[in-house]
Structure formats: structure tokens, C-alpha cells
């Protein structure tokens, strides 16, 4: 807490300058009128104050409007953000997408911090929704947004934002996202043609069902091993060894390099080994040629 | 450009832990695997096991099997293999090296983390 | 496990010769699952050839591979001075993966 001293002489602000950096922290206290620095926030950016000089400012303004601060000022606050805690974020009411922006940008290349994340709730819950222009301007600064979000958070987000997602977005995605997104998606993509749809389609596969993982399958999609890898493992199990060849295409043959990792590895232990022999990559652990299958979870639903 | 940056050198005592990274860049992280491949002096090359980024499902070799782990952070990119209970066998070079998710060729390898066991 | 026997452990060769190291497996290995790599002192082992027969990307064309079953051969057409190194064939046919334990090939 700066004292409450009268300013000097001379010394009192008519304009935000490079004259200020030269004043002490008091002085700044003393001279600057916060309702001056409100309306000229867009100048401090240009100006190298000091921290413990943006600590001076930021106690004026806090000062000036102890509800939160007006958008007008959040929108220019720059490097001042950084000075700002989750508490005090907690009583903005952001709307503009371009304060979000100005305010991302400023924590550009930055892991995100807690006060970015709680900016982030805050504009988000004041729009009602994750609407595509915001999702577009959330994934480009932190690709890792989409997957930052819960499954119930997710589920606010329309099928129209989904044409934002890039394949990036969604890599430190879990299935129980990929669940909620991959429903939304296939609404999305829904008018679009095969090998199109796929494109689109295939960084949300993850959360697919086994219905259209056999529809895919008679679509020469040629899916790769990366995304194979990605599906759900109850999705895969009930897959014919004809529907997976028809599915990877030219990439079946990658099943071999994966044949010990899930779901590669589950699938396998399903499947006949006369069928997977036809395959001609060497998989091994098939069910035995004269063997007899119980699908016991078929009896379980029946009794 | 594709890169795999280890971490340094390393010297531990019988029956220490050590945990080696290796960094990625310049690529799709989920699209590959990292297999992590020994060479103890002179000697030739030893296959560990390997890690799938995008399941974090692992894969060791049996003569590892319960001493080494192996995790990853898709948040930086990086692979950790931890090796404990180390012995004197386990002085070696050890490397990570990219493989593409459905090959079984390696067509990128770190530079390599000497490590040391010495009591 | 199948186990990768090279020959020769050693080769010491004229610049311009034809060198051949051979790879012998234990038991069957698909042909596609077959790799080699080349290692030069102080250095990571690089990819040479894949799939028993093709070059990796920026491998000059005197390096070829061949073979089948269990046989498998390296061959560098004209040997030069960059080429000394140790060179391992590598198997992902059967679990565990395997390398061969190595041919050094030295320059006269």
C-alpha cells in the first residue's frame, strides 16, 4: 500500500507519458489522476514502466472502480493484465471479442495462466455459449483449449462451432470428450461427400460407435493406423477382420507394427485366426481354428 | 525440422532410478510412436519398448519388464523413460527414436543419454 | 525371440568395392518387417532401409537391400569414404524386437 502524500509542485499529470517513468512509485500515486489513466490506458502499453510502477497503476484504477473495471479499460489494460489476479477478473463483464483478443495476446506463447483460464469462464458464460467466432479466436492462441473443457462444458458448444476445430485441437482430447464432440461433428459435416466427410470427420473418431465405423468401412476411406489407434476399443471389437481391412485400406498391413497395443491388440484376441491369416501380416492370438465363441454378454442381456 | 532433444548425461549407483526425457518437435506427436533403443559400450542395439503418445499405451520388452516405465506429456511433447533397481549392466547409451504409428522402423533417434551405474 | 546373426562382424574394404553383409534370422521373418541402420562412431544410429528393399529418404543409391525368409543382404554397390560405419539389421516380425549385433566396416 503506496502513503497518501500531496504531489509536488509541478509534477502533476496532465496527459500518460514517458515523463511518468522517471516518477517514484509515490510520486506516480500522488500525480496521476486514475479517472486520466482510465481514459488513456491505450498509452501505457507504449510506456517501459517498471512492475512496481504498473503495481502503482493498477492499485489507482483498482481504486477508481472496486466493482471491476469497465470494458473500455479492460480492452486497453496490456501489459497490466499480467498484474491482474483471478479475483479481480471475477468482477469484469467481458463481452467484446476484441478484448479478448488484446487480452490473449498479451499472454501469447505462455502456458495457460489462471487468470487467462478465468477470463476465459468469464466470457464465455456471459456469451451463454461457445460460439464458433470465439472458439476460432480460443484455439488459435492455445490449441489445447477445446480439451481443457469437461464434458459438460463441452456439451454447450453448437455443431456449427465444431468447423473450427483444427486436427490439433483436439490431441490431449480423452474419449469421454471425443464422446460429447464427435456427435456434434458428425451433425456438422453431415451435408458433406464422402472423402470430405472423412477429412473433417476423422479427428473426432475417437468417440465414434461401431455403427459408423462400419459405415466408414464400405466408404474406401483408407483410414491410417494413427487414427485407428484413437478409436474406442468397444467400438473396434465388434469389427470383422473383412470391415478393418476395408477400413485401413492400404494400411492394414500397419496392424502388425501396432498388434500389442489396445485396440489393436484387444481386436486380435476377438477374431478367428483363419480370418486374420487372410490378412498375410503374420498376426498372432486369434481365436484357434475348431474353437466354439460365447458372446456371454448377449446371454447376460437375454436372462 | 524434425527433432528429438534428450536429456544429459546421467551417473546413478546400483540400485537407483534413472529417468531419461526426450523432447519432440517439428511434428504431429500423436501420429508416432517413441521406441526407446540401449546400447550398452560397445556393444550393439537393444529394443526397450515403445510408448503410443496419443493412448499413452506402453509396450516393454520382457527382459524389462517391471523395472522400466514409460510415460509422456502431450502438453510439451516429451517422453520419459524411467529405468529402475539399476545395476552395473545398465551402463549404456540410451536413445528414443520415432516410429510412425503402423511401421516398425525407426527414422528418427534422439542424440542419445549416457548413463552411468556406478557404485 | 528371433535372433538376428550378422556376418561379418568385421570388414575392412578399398574405397570403390562392392560390400555385402548378410542377415540371418533364427526363425521366418515377413520381409516387409525388416530393417537396417547405419551408425557412425559417436553417432545415433540413422534409417538406411526399410521393408528390406527401400531407401529411406537421402540415402544415396549404392546402398541396396535384399532377401527373404530368413536370409536377408545389405549390399553398398561402390564403397566410399563416408561409409565407414557399423551397420544392424533389425526385425519387427515377432515380439520382442530384435537388431542384429552389428558389422563394422572399416576403410582401407
Known amino acids: 500500500e503506496v502513503e497518501k502524500t500531496a504531489c509536488p509542485s509541478g509534477k502533476k499529470a496532465r496527459e500518460i507519458d514517458e515523463s511518468l517513468i522517471f516518477y517514484k512509485k509515490w510520486e506516480l500515486e500522488a500525480c496521476v489522476d486514475a479517472a486520466l489513466l482510465a481514459t488513456q490506458m491505450d498509452r501505457v502499453n507504449a510506456i517501459p514502466f517498471t512492475y512496481e510502477q504498473l503495481d502503482v497503476l493498477k492499485h489507482k484504477l483498482d481504486e477508481l472502480y472496486p466493482q471491476g473495471y469497465p470494458e473500455s479499460v479492460i480492452q486497453h489494460l496490456g501489459y497490466l493484465f499480467l498484474k491482474m489476479s483471478p479475483e479481480d477478473i471475477r468482477k469484469w463483464n467481458v463481452t467484446s471479442l476484441e478484448t479478448l483478443k488484446a487480452l490473449l495476446e498479451v499472454n501469447k506463447g505462455h502456458e495457460m495462466s489462471p487468470q487467462v483460464a478465468t477470463l476465459i469462464d468469464r466470457f464465455v458464460k456471459g456469451r451463454g455459449q461457445l460460439d464458433k467466432d470465439t472458439l476460432d479466436t480460443l484455439t488459435a492462441f492455445y490449441p489445447g483449449y477445446l480439451c481443457s473443457l469437461s464434458p459438460e462444458e463441452l456439451s454447450s458448444v453448437p455443431p456449427s462451432s465444431i468447423w473450427a476445430v483444427r486436427p490439433q485441437d483436439l490431441d490431449t482430447c480423452d474419449p469421454r470428450q471425443l464422446d460429447v464432440l464427435y456427435p456434434k461433428a458428425r451433425l456438422a459435416f453431415q451435408n458433406m461427400n464422402g472423402s470430405e466427410y472423412f477429412v473433417k470427420i476423422q479427428s473426432f473418431l475417437g468417440g465414434a460407435p461401431t455403427e459408423d465405423l462400419k459405415a466408414l468401412s464400405q466408404q474406401n476411406v483408407s483410414m491410417d493406423l494413427a487414427t485407428f489407434m484413437k478409436l474406442r476399443t468397444d467400438a473396434v471389437l465388434p469389427l470383422t477382420v473383412a470391415e478393418v481391412q476395408k477400413l485401413l485400406g492400404p494400411h492394414v498391413e500397419g496392424l502388425k507394427a501396432e498388434e500389442r497395443h489396445r485396440p489393436v491388440r484387444d481386436w486380435i484376441l476377438r477374431q478367428r485366426q483363419d480370418d486374420l491369416d487372410t490378412l498375410g501380416l503374420g498376426l498372432q492370438g486369434g481365436i484357434p481354428n475348431g474353437y466354439l465363441v460365447l458372446d456371454l454378454s448377449m446371454q447376460e442381456a437375454l436372462s | 525440422e524434425v527433432q528429438l532433444v534428450q536429456s544429459g548425461a546421467e551417473v546413478k549407483k546400483p540400485g537407483a532410478s534413472v529417468k531419461v526425457s526426450c523432447k519432440a518437435s517439428g511434428y504431429t506427436f500423436t501420429d508416432y510412436n517413441m521406441d526407446w533403443v540401449r546400447q550398452a559400450p560397445g556393444q550393439g542395439l537393444e529394443w526397450m519398448g515403445d510408448?503410443?503418445?496419443?493412448?499413452?499405451?506402453?509396450i516393454y520388452n520382457q527382459k524389462f519388464q517391471g523395472r522400466v516405465t514409460m510415460t509422456e506429456d502431450k502438453s510439451t511433447s516429451t517422453v520419459y523413460m524411467e529405468l529402475s533397481s539399476l545395476r552395473s549392466e545398465d551402463t549404456a547409451v540410451y536413445y528414443c527414436a520415432r516410429r510412425r504409428i503402423g511401421t516398425g522402423y525407426f527414422d528418427v533417434w534422439g542424440q542419445g543419454t549416457t548413463v552411468t551405474v556406478s557404485s | 525371440e528371433i535372433v538376428l546373426t550378422q556376418s561379418p562382424d568385421f570388414q575392412s574394404v578399398t574405397p570403390k568395392e562392392k560390400v555385402t553383409i548378410t542377415c540371418s534370422a533364427s526363425s521366418s521373418v515377413i520381409s516387409s518387417y525388416l530393417s537396417w541402420y547405419q551408425q557412425k562412431p559417436d553417432q545415433s544410429p540413422k534409417l538406411l532401409i526399410y521393408?528390406?528393399?527401400n531407401l529411406a529418404s537421402g540415402v544415396p543409391s549404392r546402398f541396396s537391400g535384399s532377401g527373404s525368409g530368413t536370409d536377408f543382404t545389405l549390399t553398398i554397390n561402390s564403397l566410399e569414404a563416408e561409409d565407414a560405419a557399423t551397420y544392424y539389421c533389425?526385425?519387427?516380425?515377432?515380439?520382442?524386437?530384435?537388431f542384429g549385433g552389428g558389422t563394422k566396416v572399416e576403410i582401407k
Open positions: 533389425h526385425q519387427w516380425s515377432s515380439f520382442p524386437y530384435t
Open positions: 521393408r528390406t528393399s
Open positions: 510408448i503410443n503418445p496419443s493412448t499413452g499405451g506402453t
